[in-house]
């Protein structure tokens, strides 16, 4: 799996999970989230050569096409596979609200 | 939807469905498929700016992060959303075989 256990341990040009910490105020200009101040969002990036974690038959065919025709601009892309939610605390007036935002943290990647 | 009806009608730099016809013999070097000789595989490509068909909360956050921090290398990617199968005819010896290959044709795209 192209997850932290594999990707953060290996030097990898190919599609893999990359660490990304987002500070809500500094990086997004958000002041409305009280806690946490930021989170490990992570992201997916890297090349998708033949058979590198192909998600569908189309991505397998496309990576084969791209290998045989390297001048072609059509190739699969490295995107999130498994995502997890993030629990945040914010205020409406003086009333605290706890909310779980779905699909906020990338845990693994794939070529799609 | 970023499908043929929209994407093939509009000149679009952003994430959209792109036409791609794959000739099995010429483009993949395959002689084993008897029919069809090729097919409209299509592919997804283009930029994923803020709110352009974001697939998840993470991709929305990432596109916002990328807008505010344009020097960052983290951004969503344009990938297939809806896929359809392709029915092929091939031979094993002199015996014809019909098989449906799932997820071979891209019908629409998303930023993920």
């Amino acid at each position: 799996a192209l997850d932290a256990a594999y990707c953060f341990r290996n030097v990898q040009d190919n599609c893999c999970l990359r660490p990304l910490y987002i500070d809500f105020k500094r990086d997004l200009g958000w002041k409305w989230i009280h806690e946490p101040k930021g989170y490990n969002a992570n992201f997916c990036a890297g090349a998708c050569p033949y058979l590198w974690s192909s998600d569908t038959q189309h991505s397998r065919v496309l990576s084969l096409y791209n290998t045989i025709n390297p001048e072609a601009s059509a190739s699969p892309c490295c995107v999130s596979q498994d995502l997890e939610p993030l629990t945040i605390l914010y205020y409406i007036g003086k009333t605290p609200k706890i909310e779980q935002l779905s699909n906020m943290i990338v845990k693994s990647c794939k070529c799609s | 939807a970023l499908d043929a009806a929209y994407c093939f009608r509009n000149v679009q730099d952003n994430c959209c469905l792109r036409p791609l016809y794959i000739d099995f013999k010429r483009d993949l070097g395959w002689k084993w498929i008897h029919e069809p000789k090729g097919y409209n595989a299509n592919f997804c490509a283009g930029a994923c700016p803020y709110l352009w068909s974001s697939d998840t909360q993470h991709s929305r956050v990432l596109s916002l992060y990328n807008t505010i921090n344009p020097e960052a290398s983290a951004s969503p990617c344009c990938v297939s959303q809806d896929l359809e199968p392709l029915t092929i005819l091939y031979y094993i010896g002199k015996t014809p075989k019909i098989e449906q290959l799932s997820n071979m044709i891209v019908k629409s795209c998303k930023c993920s």
Partner: nanobody, 120 residues
Framework: QLQLVESGGGLVQPGGSLRLSCTAS???????????MAWFRQTPGKQRELVAL??????NYADSVKGRFTISRDNAKNTVYLQMNMLQPEDTAVYVC????????????WGQGTQVTVSS
């Protein structure tokens, strides 16, 4: 039971040659079409690299091996070969073969790998 068996690896001096073989056994390879055969190589701590690939009428090579390596296949023997000439120390790796078979979709099978060491 479907199996890929590689052979031909070993220790060779720089400038030397080796011929790797990968034979596919098991009924799957006799019953279903093969859509691609390929050789990859893996070195510790580095990513798996596609070395050479062949389909029915197309071949492709990594830039680093072009002009030195040749991939070929013998359909009757269900075997794919990798002829490696002018070997260099940077070619040292575990070489793994992969066979793509059309079996309820595009399925891929991996061998166990064979070690190639180029050293004087």
């Amino acid at each position: 039971q479907l199996q890929l068996v590689e052979s031909g690896g070993g220790l060779v001096q720089p400038g030397g040659s080796l011929r790797l073989s990968c034979t596919a056994s098991g009924s799957t390879f006799e019953i279903y079409p093969i859509y691609a055969m390929a050789w990859f190589r893996q070195t510790p701590g580095k990513q798996r690299e596609l070395v050479a690939l062949t389909t029915d009428v197309k071949t492709n090579y990594a830039d680093s091996v072009k002009g030195r390596f040749t991939i070929s296949r013998d359909n009757a023997k269900n075997t794919v070969y990798l002829q490696m000439n002018m070997l260099q120390p940077e070619d040292t790796a575990v070489y793994v073969c992969n066979v793509g078979v059309v079996r309820g979709g595009l399925q891929n099978y991996w061998g166990q790998g064979t070690q190639v060491t180029v050293s004087s």
